[in-house]
Interface confidence: low
């Protein structure tokens, strides 16, 4: 058993049929010694008396809010949550496996630049009685600070018969050094509590590996005289690290016909303009990637040819 | 060239070669499948490679103030990786083809380090750790590790030279 926060405790249980469970001793937080009784949740049934209560925690029915009283007055509470371990593996019932980029991916994180700011998100089908708490650090043995905000519900989607809820959190490294080469990964830890079930999820990454620039901005076409060619120009996204002479991007320009089956013409360039042939009913799209490190491409920015 | 007395390197040449190094480092070891979280229980992690750290003056402001600190750190790293790529880890079994991207990468690391430091002037270089596992299998794993670290290192070096070429060239 360990303390998650004040008056909230997590009991770690090996979860299998007829498991013996864990013996837990609760102590009433009071100077009183006599006349103390214990109850669980809303029930008025007295579970025991005395300053301590010993219970055998085997299942969710044994978890909940234990309260000690004296003469009708509440003295203190202890909330017990369960963390299930099945065959040596902690349960992952609360969050949905996003399966991208690999199986057992519960947390996904992205950064728009090298400022040390990043966003993580996760999915669940649970709509109520759900709380999340997020902690993060750079490195684990001698951790350096990363501050995370509160996790918020950022999207709801209908998937077949199920509703899916996306939660996200923004974190910022306290003393970020955008120009340095990272040697210790960022660690993100999410505590999830659904009713009386506790689970924790972790992710570990270098900012450089989760970089995904925003799409290029101000994408414009300028027809060239007496030609089917156009000059496409764009700018670095506002959110990208500066100066751009240091934090450089490379770009992919694509001409795509109306039909997905039509051949795509692609040009790669380090410049912020390119000359391409604009076909009727086609569109021109541009995306960006860090010039020197192969992290994710941005989403496409697009304009029609006409 | 970063000659004794601290004059400027050939920023544009360094920019071109460092960008080529980035390309070679990724062709030597592209992303295979997807990046993963580390699996616990992987005991062989080698982090004794030189990193370009916050105080090394490789940020835009530090380069403007005095680029020599940063160039010296980059030079140390280039020599370190050049030695690693020429060591038994890469030359031993399982053997690589002579024209593999690793061979080109090795040559380019040497080329850039020579651009930064001509003959007769010596910056202190970091000792290469004795990392020569006996098994081809362990060597293969070290190649992954080293090339991944190198990708991060040359990315920072390429940013330095790109910025230098754009803002510090005479």
């Amino acid at each position: 058993i360990w303390e998650l926060k004040k008056d909230v405790y997590v009991v770690e249980l090996d979860w299998y049929p007829d498991a013996p469970g864990e013996m837990v001793v609760l102590t009433c937080d009071t100077p009183e010694e006599d006349g103390i009784t214990w109850t669980l949740d809303q029930s008025s049934e007295v579970l025991g008396s005395g300053k301590t209560l010993t219970i055998q925690v085997k299942e969710f029915g044994d978890a909940g809010q234990y309260t000690c009283h004296k003469g009708g007055e509440v003295l203190s509470h202890s909330l017990l949550l369960l963390h299930k371990k099945e065959d040596g593996i902690w349960s992952t019932d609360i969050l949905k496996d996003q399966k991208e980029p690999k199986n057992k991916t519960f947390l996904r994180c992205e950064a728009k630049n090298y400022s040390g700011r990043f966003t993580c998100w996760w999915l669940t089908t649970i709509s109520t009685d759900l709380t999340f708490s997020v902690k993060s650090s750079r490195g684990s043995s001698d951790p350096q600070g990363v501050t995370c905000g509160a996790a918020t519900l950022s999207a709801e989607r209908v998937r077949g018969d199920n509703k899916e809820y996306e939660y996200s959190v923004e974190c910022q490294e306290d003393s970020a050094c955008p120009a340095a080469e990272e040697s210790l990964p960022i660690e993100v830890m999410v505590d999830a509590v659904h009713k009386l079930k506790y689970e924790n999820y972790t992710s570990s990454f270098f900012i450089r590996d989760i970089i995904k620039p925003d799409p290029p901005k101000n994408l414009q076409l300028k027809p060239l005289k007496n030609s089917r060619q156009v000059e496409v120009s764009w700018e670095y996204p506002d959110t990208w690290s500066t100066p751009h002479s240091y934090f450089s991007l490379t770009f992919c320009v694509q001409v795509q016909g109306k039909s997905k089956r039509e051949k795509k013409d692609r040009v790669f360039t380090d410049k912020t303009s390119a000359t391409v042939i604009c076909r009727k009913n086609a569109s021109i799209s541009v995306r960006a990637q860090d010039r020197y490190y192969s992290s994710s491409w941005s989403e496409w920015a697009s304009v029609p040819c006409s | 060239r970063a000659v004794p007395g601290g004059s400027s390197p050939a920023w544009t040449q360094c920019q071109q070669l460092s960008q080529k190094l980035c390309t070679l480092a990724w062709s030597a070891h592209p992303l295979v499948g997807h990046m993963d979280l580390r699996e616990e229980g992987d005991e062989e992690t080698t982090n004794d490679v030189p990193h370009i750290q916050c105080g090394d003056g490789c940020d835009p402001q530090g380069l403007r103030d005095n680029s020599q600190f940063c160039l010296q750190r980059i030079h140390q790293g280039l020599i370190f990786y050049e030695k690693l790529l020429g060591s038994d880890i890469f030359t031993g079994e399982p053997s690589l083809l002579p024209d593999s991207p690793v061979a080109q990468l090795h040559a380019s690391l040497l080329g850039l380090s020579q651009l930064l430091q001509p003959e007769g002037h010596h910056w202190e270089t970091q000792q290469i750790p004795s990392l020569s596992p006996s098994q081809p299998w362990q060597r293969l794993l070290l190649r992954f590790k080293i090339l991944r670290s190198l990708q991060a290192f040359v990315a920072v070096a390429a940013r330095v030279f790109a910025h230098g070429a754009a803002t510090l060239s005479p």
Epitope: K102 | H29, V32, H34, E39, T46, N47, P94, L96, L140
Partner: antibody, heavy 126, light 108 residues
Framework: QVQLVQSGAEVKKPGSSVKVSCKAS????????ISWVRQAPGQGLEWMGI???????WYAQKFQGRVTITADESTSTAYMELSSLRSEDTAVYYC????????????????????WGQGTLVTVSS | DIVLTQSPATLSLSPGERATLSCRAS???????LAWYQQKPGQAPRLLIY???RRATGVPARFSGSGSGTDFTLTISSLEPEDFATYYC?????????FGQGTKVEIK
């Protein structure tokens, strides 16, 4: 769902060669990390060699000089050729994909095989 | 080469019983590099356990692996009819990657 589909059974004369293919169907595939394992009738499993990213190809000492492992990325097919066949080479030959593990934060092949072909029986008989 | 010796060669048990299979290495193997496979007649092997104790995808919870150094164990907590098969351990610590000779679990 990726599957490894191997070529059909072969009957070969002693001294000749056999080339077994292993094609991936139904998903992304890289010939990197395809190992070959054989199993003689009623016997155990024996690792022969691997086509390994960043390591060219390498083989168990026992088969060195007789086995050649190649791959054609364009057709998602791996090949194993065994020459100078003898009767004791009669076996089922499997191609197998390495499970991915992690090393310093990055994927590498574990050489533990999480996906297998159905096997190809090679019979060497005069 | 690392030699893996499995014991017993054959294990005769009834459904519902617990099976304990042993794999001993001729020299120390990092637990990162030990796996267990199940093979049924006429089929390819199937990965059960890797990293000595981690279950592969889709493997039932009744299968568990343990051990380190030179001694490793595969345990099937309660045998189901479909578990009667041959089991192989494999090391990937050193090349060549070797397999044990197998333990056949048969119905008593």
């Amino acid at each position: 769902q990726v599957q490894l589909v191997q070529s059909g059974a072969e009957v070969k004369k002693p001294g000749s060669s056999v080339k077994v293919s292993c094609k991936a169907s139904g998903g992304t595939f890289s010939s990197n990390y395809i190992s070959w394992v054989r199993q003689a009738p009623g016997q155990g499993l024996e690792w022969m060699g691997i086509n390994a990213h960043l390591g060219g190809t390498w083989y168990a000492q026992k088969f060195q000089g007789r086995v050649t492992i190649t791959a054609d990325e364009s057709t998602s097919t791996a090949y194993m050729e065994l020459s100078s066949l003898r009767s004791e080479d009669t076996a089922v030959y499997y191609c197998a994909r390495s499970k991915k593990g992690m090393y310093g934060g990055w994927t590498y092949p574990l050489m533990m095989f999480d996906l297998w072909g159905q096997g190809t029986l090679v019979t060497v008989s005069s | 080469d690392i030699v893996l010796t499995q014991s017993p060669a054959t294990l005769s048990l009834s459904p519902g019983e617990r099976a304990t299979l042993s794999c001993r290495a001729s020299q120390s193997v990092s637990s990162n590099y030990l796996a267990w496979y199940q093979q049924k007649p006429g089929q390819a092997p199937r990965l059960l356990i890797y990293y000595a104790s981690r279950r592969a995808t889709g493997v039932p919870a009744r299968f568990s692996g343990s051990g380190s150094g030179t001694d490793f164990t595969l345990t099937i907590s309660s045998l189901e009819p479909e578990d009667f098969a041959t089991y192989y351990c494999q090391q990937t610590s050193n090349t060549p990657f070797t397999f044990g000779q197998g333990t056949k679990v048969e119905i008593k």
